[in-house]
């Protein structure tokens, strides 16, 4: 499941880069797959919100819980907040097994 999600993510990032005019030398944060979910490219100062992966939302059907954010800073992406384990109830390592 996660291999398929990763492939879809890379396609989404490519499309987003084209739409936003992003390239490797653009300021901001490149889109990325972090082994759990997909993060679209972002400009510095932008906060991006993503939901816990659908696979795990059965454990957390509450719509305003199970949301993770990252800030795009001049140094790149911040750590996710909350961490996946606290927001979604599962760990990055679990998504790889």
């Amino acid at each position: 499941i996660f291999k398929k999600e990763q492939a879809m993510c890379l396609e989404k990032i490519q499309r987003a880069n084209e739409l936003m005019g992003f390239n490797d030398s653009s300021p901001g944060c490149p889109g990325m797959w972090d082994n759990i979910t997909c993060w679209k490219p972002a400009h510095v100062g932008e906060m991006v919100l993503v939901s816990c992966p659908e696979l795990f939302r059965i454990f957390n059907p509450d719509q305003d819980m199970g949301v993770v954010s990252r800030n795009c800073t001049e140094d790149g992406w911040s750590e996710p907040f909350p961490h996946y384990f606290d927001a979604c109830g599962f760990d990055e390592y679990e998504s790889e097994t």
């Epitope: 957390n60 819980m65 949301v67 907040f81 909350p82 961490h83 606290d86 390592y93």
Partner: antibody, heavy 123, light 107 residues
């Protein structure tokens, strides 16, 4: 029915190591849906979460920054128990120590607790 | 660390009363909040998780509400066994932190 039974000394000398064990019955320390936590309680600091261990294909730990340099939480799969070690203790570490199981349903919560062990740090 | 505060720190009530305890977080925690009851010499006992979900086996006179930074535990028709200390706890970020407690005693 899940039960947590704590054991360990109630008196530890300053600079020594505090060691407590939490024996699990009715569940397994390797349960992939659970986390295994240590919490302490004192009049001066209230309830203080110290850290947790859990198994998700491999063992992982999270520790509170306040004790990170001194704490180790270890699982023992053969006995289905987990332990707390706190090094270089001072009288400020005097507290009632609890083990607890963490479970997930929309968030993490502590649904079963050990009976508590009063640990006094004194020479 | 996220700071949790509770009010009041203590309250006196009578059997049958409806009481409300408030918990406030120092930052937005959605509904990643739990409530516990503790009696002297005993371990805390889970009452409410996710701010508003009643733990199995807990009487329905206990209820939780709130989101964001402000939360409430309500006990309808206080019973003799409810005289205890109540704690809130956030679980959005480690270290998980607890409120200082609210002691409920007999008027």
């Amino acid at each position: 029915q899940v039960q947590l039974q704590q054991s360990g000394p109630g008196l530890v000398k300053p600079s020594q190591t505090l060691s407590l064990t939490c024996a699990i019955s009715g569940d397994s320390v390797s349960n992939k849906q659970a986390t295994w936590n240590w919490i302490r309680q004192s009049p001066s600091r209230g309830l203080e979460w110290l850290g947790r261990t859990y198994y998700r294909g491999k063992w992982k730990n999270h520790y509170a920054v306040s004790v990170k340099s001194r704490i180790t939480i270890n699982p023992d799969t053969s006995k289905s128990q987990f332990s707390l070690q706190l090094n270089s203790v001072t009288p400020e570490d005097t507290a009632v120590y609890y083990c607890a199981r963490g479970m997930w349903n929309q968030n993490w919560f502590l649904d079963h607790w050990g009976q508590g062990t009063l640990v006094t740090v004194s020479s | 660390d996220i700071q949790m505060t509770q009010s009041p720190s203590s309250l006196s009530a009578s059997v049958g009363d409806r009481i409300t305890i408030t918990c406030r977080a120092s930052q937005y925690i959605v509904r990643y909040l739990n409530w516990y009851q503790q009696k002297p010499g005993k371990a805390p006992k889970l009452l409410i998780y996710g701010a508003r979900n009643l733990q199995s086996g807990i009487p329905s006179r206990f209820s939780g509400s709130g989101s964001g930074t402000d939360f409430t535990l309500t006990i309808n028709s206080l019973q003799p066994e409810d005289f205890a200390t109540y704690f809130c706890q956030q679980s959005i970020q480690t270290p998980y932190t607890f409120g200082p407690g609210t002691k409920v005693d007999i008027k």
